[in-house]
Each structure stands twice: as structure tokens, then as C-alpha cells.
Amino acid sequence: KNLKSPQKVEVDIIDDNFILRWNRSDESVGNVTFSFDYQKTGMDNWIKLSGCQNITSTKCNFSSLKLNVYEEIKLRIRAEKENTSSWYEVDSFTPFRKAQIGPPEVHLEAEDKAIVIHISPGTKDSVMWALDGLSFTYSLVIWKNSSGVEERIENIYSRHKIYKLSPETTYCLKVKAALLTSWKIGVYSPVHCIKTTVENELPPPENIEVSVQNQNYVLKWDYTYANMTFQVQWLHAFLKRNPGNHLYKWKQIPDCENVKTTQCVFPQNVFQKGIYLLRVQASDGNNTSFWSEEIKFDTEIQAFLLPPVFNIRSLSDSFHIYIGAPKQSGNTPVIQDYPLIYEIIFWENTSNAERKIIEKKTDVTVPNLKPLTVYCVKARAHTMDEKLNKSSVFSDAVCEKTKPGNTSK
């Protein structure tokens, strides 16, 4: 009886693993083996595919073959018993184009309200991604084990920290890699779960802001308790993009080491032009907090985007706010030749309930106020350029009393 050629050959490539699967043409014929040949572009001769000769199953692995992954390759298969079937040719393919990115390796660390995720490619020193290894980005799906409600986080790098979690809670996540340059999305990792720790005695500092005063940067933050010491560290933001780097060499800001106030002042020349990350930690001498959330700090933007200066004209039921250019040292106004949008926050002095107004104009009316009531106002500027999505810090709050009820506009 003539042997039929195997059919439906599938080539699966994940990272550096090359797997072939096919269907037997005739299930009734026993003891059949299968063999593959391959042919490179521009070659006439066929070469035996090592790892895929005289195979009794319908799957074989030819990962050991050292191929140029960017070069087209053609495969053919035949069945063998006493005689052989005719060859069945598989459509030619380029390994790199066909390859999928495998599941990344994931390693988790827990704090009380945060999880650190270390991600590395599933195949170390992969040949397939040798030219693209630096371009991997990752995305993840995370959920509370108890609820299953998923949150997606896109475009993260090899080390990522998720904040604002609950203590003593199990979170699960899965991660996949992407090579956006090649339009490739990878396979999800297995699910990894970790339980956040018991709540730390000391919370991390919050609401870190940088502003410019004279030739100095002023770094401010909020803290729950008094009589603490703080330290501030910085890191070049680009280091986060280095996929092989899990050691972030955070550096101390000398003027912000063991400070006893919730702010520190350091010269602008501490930082060269660039984008940095800053973080703050609190200590009471016995216990230490975990590090605060990291804030991004761009020296270029910080240098020019100063909080707005404004005057208030008080009426009985409203404030008229006139926004002017911020002042530098020596009381000279700063010329800001790019469009700004202003965020104005106001609140009744005796209340914490804040209201917000967003305006492009430099004269703003704050309506619906009560007469003879003290209201406080603070403002900040935002750039309108999407690429330069930056904000100044808030100005100091200015508090004014509205006029009695009979005042007309």
C-alpha cells in the first residue's frame, strides 16, 4: 500500500524553541516514522533537519539547528515505513516573522501597600530577540485574589512598582512582553500571586512636589507624624528602561539626608539637565517607612514652569482672580511663551471641601460664594502641549473675605 504524505504541518516558534506538529494521513497504518528536510533561500539542495528524523510521534523540536532567524526557510516532510511517501512541502517562512514572544519570568516582592515586579525575558540570551532585547516592554493584568476584578497596566519596563494596595491582601498577576517595533505581542506568563505584608508602623511620605526658588530646588512632602527624619534619593529616569538592569542605584541628595522638616532645599546645580525620579523615606530612629511613590522630575520643565502669581478682587458672592506671570528672584516676571491652562482650587477656610476651576484665561471669576466668608485660593499652571504634559506646583494659598451681601458687581 502506498504511504500518504503527512498533512497540515504547523510551525510553532516561541522564543528560541522551534516546534513542528503535523497530522498523520493514515491512522490505520502503524509503525510509521516521519522525517523532515529543510532548504535555505538560494539553495537547491535539501538538508536533513536534525532533531526531526525518523520520528514516531507527530511532533518534533528543531531548536538545536542554528538558523539565521531573518532568512527564509522551506521545510518538507515524508512518512516512512518499508517504503516512503512523497514529500509534502510546507510554505516557506522566516523564523523571526513567525516567532512569538514567550512568557516572561516574573519575580515579586511585597511591601505593605505595594508590590515590586521584576520581569525578565523567559529565554536568557535569546537568539531570536538578540537585536530587539532592549526594546521589550511589558504589560500586566493584576487582580485581588478575593475579587477577581482586573486592572491592566500597559508599557512597563523590567522593574515596576504598583502602589496604593491593601495590606495583608493576596494579589495575583500575569505579565506578557511586547516588541512594538515588530508588532509582536507575547504570551502571558503563568499567574503569580503574593500577599502584601502587615501594615507598616510608619507610612511613607506623600504628595512630593518640587518647586524652584532663586537658584534652588525646594522639595516638599506631607507626613502624618512629627519628630521624624527624612532622606531623599534620586535616580536617572532612563535607567528604568534598561531591561537587563534590576539594580537601581538610587543616590542620596546630600542636602536632603536626615532632614528633620518635611522639605529640603538644594542647589539647582545638583542636577544636570535631564529627567530624574525622586523618592522620600521617613524614620523615627527605631522604625523606617517604606519609600514613597516615586515622582518624575524634569529639570527643563521645572526650571521654567513656575506657579502663577494672582490677585483677588473680592465681591459679596464671588472673587475675581487676575493671574499674572510668576516672579523670579529680584521680582522680575518670567516670560512663559507657551500656552498655559490654569487650575484654581478654592475652599471655605473653615472647611476641607475643595472646588476646582480650570481656565485658559488669566482673569477668572469664582462664583457662588457666601458673603462675609473667608475663602482660600491656590493655583497652578499646566502646559497645554500634549508632549510636554507638565504642571507647576501650587502657589501658596491666599485667603480673602467676601464683602457684605449688599455689594453689587
Epitope: H107, H118, H246, L247, K249, K251, T288
Partner: antibody, heavy 118, light 107 residues
Framework: EVQLQQSGAELVKPGASVKVSCTGS????????IHWVKQRTEQGLEWIGR????????KYAPKFQGRATITSDTSSNTAYLQLSSLTSGDTAVYYC???????????WGQGTTLTVSS | DIVMTQSQKFMSTSVGDRVSVTCKAS??????VAWYQQKPGQSPKPLIY???YRYSGVPDRFTGSGSGTDFTLTISNVQSADLAAYFC?????????FGGGTRLEIK
């Protein structure tokens, strides 16, 4: 193969100084932190301090601050631990270890025995 | 400084048994804890990092667990080769600190 090779045993007199070396092979010390750890006979491990060989930045345990100095020479891929004003309490084995922010102290030197005796 | 306390200086066990070495931190160190094995005359050998991750080549008889302030190294199916001292270490905050060590003796 990654290795940390430490200098040989030292016998020094009280009050003197000593400098122990730790040379990395199979990796570039600039990409890591190099830590030093002390172990007295039949005792536990004590962290002395660490260096970032990339810029020479150091951290020390308060107990060793002022008497221990950690330096490095990236051209020879070597880190050093110098101890001054030695006393018999400094008699111990000193280890260097590599830290990469992920695997903690994944490789250790073989140890350098320091004996302080008159 | 964070104090790492290994309350048991010595533990005695038999081949094939399961033994747990404990370590308590004086404050929350997250999961930044490592375990080392040290045999007489040798350098410490890394076993576990980040509380529960085994270094490559470490048998899966060694498992780490815990978080916050309480940590455990469990050795199941103890072998005579496991006769050694075991140290925990926190690397959450400077100065990094080690536990005093637990010496495992085989009956």
C-alpha cells in the same frame, strides 16, 4: 564563570592597618554593588558596608563607620576593604559579596582571614 | 538598626525529617529577606532570596516563606549534607543585618 577572588590571609599587629582585596571575574563590578561582611570564629555574620564601584559611593554600618574604608578600582575590577587601628576584636574572616538588586548576595569571595596579634 | 533574631541557636533533626528555621525582624522588611547556608571552613552559600525564591541549583527541599517580620526556612527530607549553619538576612534597609544563625545538627 562568575567569581570573586580575595587576597590571602593577613597577620598584623594591633594599631596597624590592613587592606584586603576582592577581584571580580566573569562580570563587571561597575554593574553591581560590592559588599563586605565580617565573621568572627564560630560567630554570626556582620555587614560592614558596600560600594558602588561606578562612582565610589559607599554606605557603612554605624559600628564600622570611620574605621573601615571601602574603595574600588574599576580598571582592575577590584574592590578593597581597609581597616585601621586594628584590635584583637578585628580578628575574623572577611568576605566580599556581589549584589545586583535582584538576587541579593548571589556570589561570595572565599574569605580572607585577618589575625590581629602582637 | 533592624535586628534579625534567630531564636534557636541549635536544632537537632534526623535524616528524612522536616525542619523549620525561623527568623524574626524587629520591623517590617517586606519580603527583602535572604537565607544562606554555611558549612565549616566555607563561604556562605546563597539558598533563598526575596523570602521564597530559590537560587538556581538549590534543591527544592529548601523553601522559604513569610513576610513583614516573620520568616521561615523549611528543609524537608533532611539529608546529611544539610548539616550546616543557616543565616537569615534583611536587605530592605541599611545597614543590612544578619540573624545570629541556627546550627543544624543531624542525630
Amino acid at each position: 564563570e562568575v567569581q570573586l577572588q580575595q587576597s590571602g590571609a593577613e597577620l598584623v599587629k594591633p594599631g596597624a592597618s590592613v587592606k584586603v582585596s576582592c577581584t571580580g571575574s566573569g562580570f563587571n563590578i561597575k554593574d553591581y554593588y560590592i559588599h563586605w561582611v565580617k565573621q568572627r570564629t564560630e560567630q554570626g555574620l556582620e555587614w560592614i558596608g558596600r560600594i558602588d564601584p561606578e562612582d565610589g559611593e559607599t554606605k557603612y554600618a554605624p559600628k564600622f563607620q570611620g574605621r573601615a574604608t571601602i574603595t574600588s578600582d574599576t580598571s582592575s575590577n577590584t574592590a578593597y576593604l581597609q581597616l585601621s587601628s586594628l584590635t584583637s576584636g578585628d580578628t575574623a574572616v572577611y568576605y566580599c559579596a556581589r549584589y545586583d538588586g535582584y538576587y541579593c548576595f548571589d556570589y561570595w569571595g572565599q574569605g580572607t582571614t585577618l589575625t590581629v596579634s602582637s | 538598626d533592624i535586628v534579625m533574631t534567630q531564636s534557636q541557636k541549635f536544632m537537632s533533626t534526623s535524616v528524612g525529617d522536616r525542619v523549620s528555621v525561623t527568623c524574626k525582624a524587629s520591623q517590617n522588611v517586606g519580603t527583602n529577606v535572604a537565607w544562606y547556608q554555611q558549612k565549616p571552613g566555607q563561604s556562605p552559600k546563597p539558598l533563598i532570596y526575596s523570602t521564597s525564591y530559590r537560587y538556581s541549583g538549590v534543591p527544592d527541599r529548601f523553601t522559604g516563606s513569610g513576610s513583614g517580620t516573620d520568616f521561615t526556612l523549611t528543609i524537608s527530607n533532611v539529608q546529611s549534607a544539610d548539616l550546616a549553619a543557616y543565616f537569615c538576612q534583611q536587605y530592605n534597609n541599611y545597614p543590612y543585618t544578619f540573624g545570629g544563625g541556627t546550627r543544624l545538627e543531624i542525630k
